[in-house]
Interface confidence: low
């Protein structure tokens, strides 16, 4: 996926065999190319035109490969394959193609805060993360905890705020929000850190 600041395309490689990455000495490289033009028929670039990045395999039983994609080429198709070297044996994956712009994972929304409106509703507000090149949709999840009830809810909105009605005095509301591209494919951001708001007793 592409980081929210659009600086790095990150490819996570996870083995179906959970212990493979843990028990063997191996090196993982990602070979990639951004062809200038893609014809209607699949274009397989010459071997020498691929660039290679070393993948860091010390994270969460998977490997992280960082591919620098120029902003101007985010809409282009990235061709890539994995090369795994272990004990003198080389494994190579099939060729894969992705459009980085369709795999943007935004940073979590910022500035999550809550306040009571004049008409007694809870207004949850946040800011869009910076540098995202398109509008986002947001998923808001919140739980209400009072002496009488525990209520949980999950909403999808395109605005940067959400009104919650029927709020109870003396209740606490724990809220998180995450974002994803509104008008096309994309990846949900991580959830923002939960925030808690306590309504005042009557």
């Amino acid at each position: 996926w592409l980081k929210g600041d659009l600086k790095l395309f990150i490819c996570y490689v996870e083995s179906l065999f959970k212990n493979l990455f843990r028990n063997y000495n191996y090196k993982v490289h990602l070979l990639y190319v951004l062809p200038e033009v893609l014809e209607d028929s699949p274009l397989v670039p010459q071997k020498g035109s691929f660039q290679m990045v070393h993948c860091n395999c010390s994270v969460h039983e998977c490997c992280e490969c960082l591919v620098p994609v120029p902003t101007a080429k985010l809409n282009d198709t990235l061709l890539m394959c994995l090369k795994i070297t272990s004990g003198g044996v080389i494994f190579q994956s099939p060729l894969m193609s992705v459009q980085p712009i369709n795999m943007v994972k935004p940073d979590p929304p910022l500035g999550l805060h809550m306040e009571i409106t004049d008409d007694g509703n809870l207004k949850i507000s946040w800011s869009s993360p910076p540098l995202v090149p398109f509008p986002l949709q947001y998923q808001v999840k919140y739980s209400e905890n009072s002496t009488t009830v525990i209520r949980e809810a999950d909403k999808i909105v395109s605005a940067t705020s959400l009104l919650v009605d029927s709020i109870l005095p003396g209740s606490s509301y724990e809220v998180q929000v995450r974002g994803k591209r509104l008008d096309g494919p994309g990846i949900w951001s991580d959830w923002s850190t939960p925030r808690v708001f306590t309504t005042q007793d009557v």
Epitope: L110, H113, D118, S127, S172, R195, V196, T198
Partner: antibody
Framework: QVQLVESGGSVVQPGRSLRLSCAAS????????MYWVRQTPGKGLEWVAV????????YYIDSVKGRFTISRDTSTNTLYLQMSSLRADDSALYYC????????????WGRGTLVTVSS | DIQMTQSPSSLSASVGDRVTITCRAS??????LNWYQQKPGKAPKLLIY???SLQSGVPSRFSGSGSGTDFTLTISSLQPEDFATYYC??????????FGQGTRLEIK
């Protein structure tokens, strides 16, 4: 220049009233949550009241509820704290402070105005 | 309300010393903790926000760490201008925003 300047502090008798002012300059006053924070040698730093950016949301620490009122005048970029039924334990240095929404820290403080409640 | 407890309440140290101040929250506040420095007659000044992010213009000898309930402010090599009172502040739950009771750092 981005700054906050408090005024209105003085020595008053218990039970009397006082109005503190905080003049803001160099930023759009109405887009921030503004706090009054007080400081005493005994209690350290303690929030007193907050006025959220929409101007209608106001919250108070329990000990001042019903006695203090926070308000603002966006035409003059001024925050107020109307204090009534003052008690000796309200004596403190009162700061006006601006809240940064992204991480909820105070990124701008005034220099404070001193309130002393004494007979 | 979330209670913030700082320790020690006062501390004597010398120029060049490494100093650590701790702050404990009464419940988990993730990384929503800020640190301020206050000198006599002055308003508090933000040093660290979000537990470990250094505020612009603050010397790199100041650092913050921690998550959940336990947090630390470290001054790697004390300078004469660092003698002051330090406060932590939780920004996880509002209202209220709450501060620690302060740690006074004095010259030994």
């Amino acid at each position: 220049q981005v700054q906050l300047v408090e005024s209105g502090g003085s020595v008053v008798q218990p039970g009397r009233s006082l109005r503190l002012s905080c003049a803001a300059s160099g930023f759009t006053f109405s887009t921030y949550a503004m706090y009054w924070v007080r400081q005493t040698p005994g209690k350290g730093l303690e929030w007193v009241a907050v006025l959220y950016s929409d101007g209608s949301n106001k919250y108070y620490i329990d000990s001042v509820k019903g006695r203090f009122t926070i308000s603002r005048d966006t035409s003059t970029n001024t925050l107020y704290l109307q204090m009534s039924s003052l008690r000796a334990d309200d004596s403190a240095l009162y700061y006006c402070a601006r809240l940064n929404w992204d991480y909820w820290y105070f990124d701008l403080w005034g220099r404070g105005t001193l309130v002393t409640v004494s007979s | 309300d979330i209670q913030m407890t700082q320790s020690p309440s006062s501390l004597s140290a010398s120029v060049g010393d490494r100093v650590t101040i701790t702050c404990r929250a009464s419940q988990s506040i993730s990384s929503y903790l800020n640190w301020y420095q206050q000198k006599p007659g002055k308003a508090p000044k933000l040093l660290i926000y979000a537990a470990s992010s250094l505020q612009s213009g603050v010397p790199s000898r100041f650092s913050g760490s921690g998550s959940g309930t336990d947090f630390t402010l470290t001054i790697s090599s004390l300078q004469p201008e660092d003698f002051a009172t330090y406060y932590c502040q939780q920004s996880y739950s509002t209202p209220p925003i709450t501060f620690g009771q302060g740690t006074r750092l004095e010259i030994k």
